[in-house]
């Protein structure tokens, strides 16, 4: 009897009610390996889940998360909400980044602004909740009499007005 069942291919099940005949999986079910005695119910992607791959007789459906959420867990078993840039996801929802930190992604945590002075540089552009600071030349480079590190501006192409 076992040998008869082992002949049943993926997409079928070994039907004990019909003398070990290989029967096709019913609608909305699948078997991904041969020799199965039952077919598994297809996963349904609904609510915050959307279908990435339809279920077939030999493979389960695959889900993704709808816009505004991202997958977590094995095979996208959970959908976690996105936050806006300048926020981080906490256990109690999306919270704005504290002063001195930023997040330029829709997920992850707020990170401290770069400390330009650690590299002997100055702050060229201030940081925001969404963006890190931009470090510029060291303060010494900007002191009067220091040679300019800026190359001369290239000649404008004819027909182009200045920006």
């Amino acid at each position: 009897l076992q040998d008869l069942c082992s002949n049943c291919p993926a997409g079928t099940f070994c039907d004990n009610n019909r003398s070990q005949i290989c029967s096709p999986c019913p609608p909305n079910s699948f078997s991904s390996a041969g020799g199965q005695r039952t077919c598994d119910i297809c996963r349904q992607c609904k609510g915050v889940f959307k279908t990435r791959k339809e279920c077939s007789s030999t493979s389960n459906a695959e889900c993704d998360c709808i816009s505004g959420y991202h997958c977590l867990g094995a095979e996208c078993s959970m959908c976690e909400q996105d936050c806006k840039q300048g926020q981080e996801l906490t256990k109690k929802g999306c919270k704005d980044c504290c002063f001195g930190t930023f997040n330029d992604q829709k997920r992850g945590i707020c990170r401290p602004w770069t400390n330009c002075s650690l590299d002997g540089k100055s702050v060229l552009v201030n940081g925001t909740k969404e963006r890190d600071v931009v470090c510029g030349p060291s303060p010494a480079d900007l002191s009067p009499g220091a040679s300019s590190a800026t190359p001369p501006a290239p000649a404008r192409e004819p027909g182009h007005s200045p920006q």
């Epitope: 906490t90 256990k91 109690k92 945590i109």
Partner: nanobody
Framework: EVQLLESGGGLVQLGGSLRLSCAAS????????MTWVRQAPEKGLEWVSS????????YYADSVKGRFTISRDNSKNTLYLQMNSLRAEDTAVYYC?????????????????WGQGTTVTVSS
């Protein structure tokens, strides 16, 4: 291999009670904080409760405070969630999760391993 296996879910009447369990293996259970989260059918993941590795500190979402109790038995490598006065909005798949450190709180998610989930349905 680190594994978390939830059990205890099922169909329960409005106002009823359920106790979820999460059996842990593959790591030193008492060294890590643990968390319960849930996902309702039409919603994203919602944090429910967290407990420190020692069990001394517990934290709850406002929506379950006073109704749910998180606990752990480190000798049995098991996490629990006692759910009382259940409401329709508690219907969800409940997941237990291992945090990366022994301490926890009600701010950051710090989770690195998730269970497969157990379904709780509250019917009226």
């Amino acid at each position: 291999e680190v594994q978390l296996l939830e059990s205890g879910g099922g169909l329960v009447q409005l106002g009823g009670s359920l106790r979820l369990s999460c059996a842990a293996s593959g790591f030193t259970f008492s060294s890590y904080a643990m968390t319960w989260v849930r996902q309702a059918p039409e919603k994203g993941l919602e944090w429910v409760s967290s407990i420190s590795g020692s069990g001394g500190n517990t934290y709850y979402a406002d929506s379950v405070k006073g109704r749910f109790t998180i606990s752990r038995d480190n000798s049995k490598n098991t996490l629990y969630l006692q759910m009382n006065s259940l409401r329709a909005e508690d219907t969800a798949v409940y997941y237990c999760a291992k945090e990366r450190t022994g301490t926890t709180g009600d701010y950051y998610y710090n989770v690195d391993v998730w269970g497969q989930g157990t379904t709780v349905t509250v019917s009226s």
